[in-house]
């Protein structure tokens, strides 16, 4: 028999154990996890509990902002005896359980981090069988998502309509970088078409390369800038390019 009492935060604490000594409820999380925007991060969370061989139904929950009341970003439920925690909620489909709750591990994986993901995250486990019990981390883990300086991931010259050529530049960064083209012809930079940004990547197109020479794509955000160039040399008399 294990007697419990609630602490001020509503968590159940093991206060007295008769017969075999049991573990107390506790949760171990790091104070902080750092990751770069666009990458993935793991929010570690392990726990101990007083229910020696609990094999009943359980629910694992992660919430953001504040404990007990913050919005849930992830929730999964494991059936009695099962090591599989079936996902019931994964905000924007970016949260996945890495740990195994049956092995006291609630570690969470967050994909494609954005600056807005920065903040505190709190893990919680609920035993919903005979041993009706629950526990949530009070201090949580702070996720610090750092911005990413621009990086040009692709620059290329492609055939365009009527034997013309066009240039594409794709860059990534967080915040998403602004792209600009410059080239040998006057007004080239103003002709750049800013394409759709996808995630942390932005593409700009220079629709018509009217002169031979060097075309430079510049990507810039608050953390810095990056440049890359392509060269267009047409062999006059025959359509072709050297880049």
């Amino acid at each position: 028999l294990v007697k419990t009492r609630r602490d001020a935060s509503g968590d159940l604490l093991n206060t007295e154990a008769h017969s075999a000594p049991a573990q107390r409820w506790s949760m171990q999380v790091p104070a902080e996890v750092n990751a770069e925007a666009g990458d993935a991060a793991v929010l570690p969370c392990t726990f101990t509990h007083p229910h020696r061989h609990y094999d009943g139904p359980l629910t694992a929950i992660w919430r953001s902002g504040e404990p007990y009341a913050g919005p849930q970003v992830f929730r999964c439920t494991a059936a009695p005896g099962s090591e599989l925690c079936q996902t019931a909620l994964s905000l924007h489909g970016r949260f996945r359980l890495l740990g195994n709750p049956r092995r006291n591990d609630l570690s969470l994986r967050v994909e494609r981090l954005a600056l807005a993901d920065s903040g505190r995250y709190f893990c919680r486990v609920e035993f919903t069988g005979d041993a009706h019990d629950r526990y949530e981390s009070r201090h949580g883990v702070r996720l610090r998502v750092t911005a990413a300086a621009p990086r040009i991931v692709n620059i290329s010259v492609l055939p365009g309509p009527a034997h013309a050529f066009r240039a594409l530049c794709t860059a990534e960064g967080e915040p998403p970088p602004a792209l600009a083209w410059s080239g040998p012809a006057p007004g080239n930079s103003s002709a750049a078409l800013q394409g759709q940004g996808h995630g942390y990547q932005v593409t700009a197109e220079l629709p018509a390369l009217t002169r031979d020479g060097r075309y430079t794509c510049t990507a810039a955000n608050s953390l810095g800038r990056a440049e890359a160039s392509v060269y267009l040399f047409r062999f006059h008399g025959a359509p072709g390019t050297s880049t």
Partner: antibody
């Protein structure tokens, strides 16, 4: 429809290089990790390399580390494997495969290319 | 790292159920719920049948199901059919580097 079309295999001498390409279509290429998996004649599957959606994270099997380089060009919906210092034991059918997730390491491979044979022999 | 262990061959009669095993360690199958199963017919590319232990991609028959206990994952094929005759490979995420390990493969024969 969703497909991966491979090119670039062939017969090469030990110590030489080869570049494999994989052209993707029918899905948003830059949403997913991509992988190379190989299968030696009459043998099982071996994961070779993986690359995350934005090339931010890359992994290699120990057997190819330092010799092979994976890369992707999201603007061209293409995946590449540059193979240098090839050895006889690299002889295999090489498959490119699409992952289910943006990160390559916790992944499964739901779309596969047709495979391209690489034979390393003198 | 070592490949996951699978039986070399398993056979069954049409309509029967068979179960393929995939045994790993506490660093891979036992530690994580990231086990996948692939079917490969001769001369063709592998096909994903199960991911994350028990999830079926769309288009895969519900005769295929996955489960896991301890360090062993299982693929069950119920109502065995002639077209199920193929090689089957399991794969798992592992805490070592590199993060993937495949199984040795099982040849399924429909008698």
């Amino acid at each position: 429809q969703v497909q991966l079309v491979q090119s670039g295999g062939g017969l090469v001498q030990p110590g030489r290089s080869l570049r494999l390409s994989c052209a993707a279509s029918g899905f948003t290429f830059d949403d997913y990790a991509m992988h190379w998996v190989r299968q030696a004649p009459g043998k099982g599957l071996e994961w070779v390399s993986g690359i995350s959606w934005n090339s931010g994270s890359i992994g290699y099997a120990d057997s190819v580390k330092g010799r092979f380089t994976i890369s992707r060009d999201n603007a061209k919906n293409s995946l590449y494997l540059q193979m240098n210092s090839l050895r006889a034991e690299d002889t295999a059918l090489y498959y490119c495969a699409k992952g289910l997730w943006p990160s390559y390491d916790l992944d499964a491979f739901d779309i596969w290319g047709q495979g391209t044979m690489v034979t390393v022999s003198s | 790292q070592s490949a996951l262990t699978q039986p070399a061959s398993v056979s069954g009669s049409p309509g029967q159920s068979i179960t393929l095993s995939c045994t790993g360690t506490s660093s891979d199958v036992g530690a994580y719920n990231f086990v996948s199963w692939y079917q490969q017919h001769p001369g063709t590319a592998p096909k994903l049948m199960i991911y994350e232990v028990s999830n079926r991609p769309s288009g895969v028959s519900d005769r295929f199901s996955g489960s896991k206990s301890g360090n062993t994952a299982s693929l069950t094929i119920s109502g065995l059919q002639a077209e199920d005759e193929a090689d089957y490979y399991c794969s798992s995420y592992t805490s070592t580097i590199p993060p993937f390990v495949f199984g040795t493969g099982t040849k399924v024969t429909v008698l």
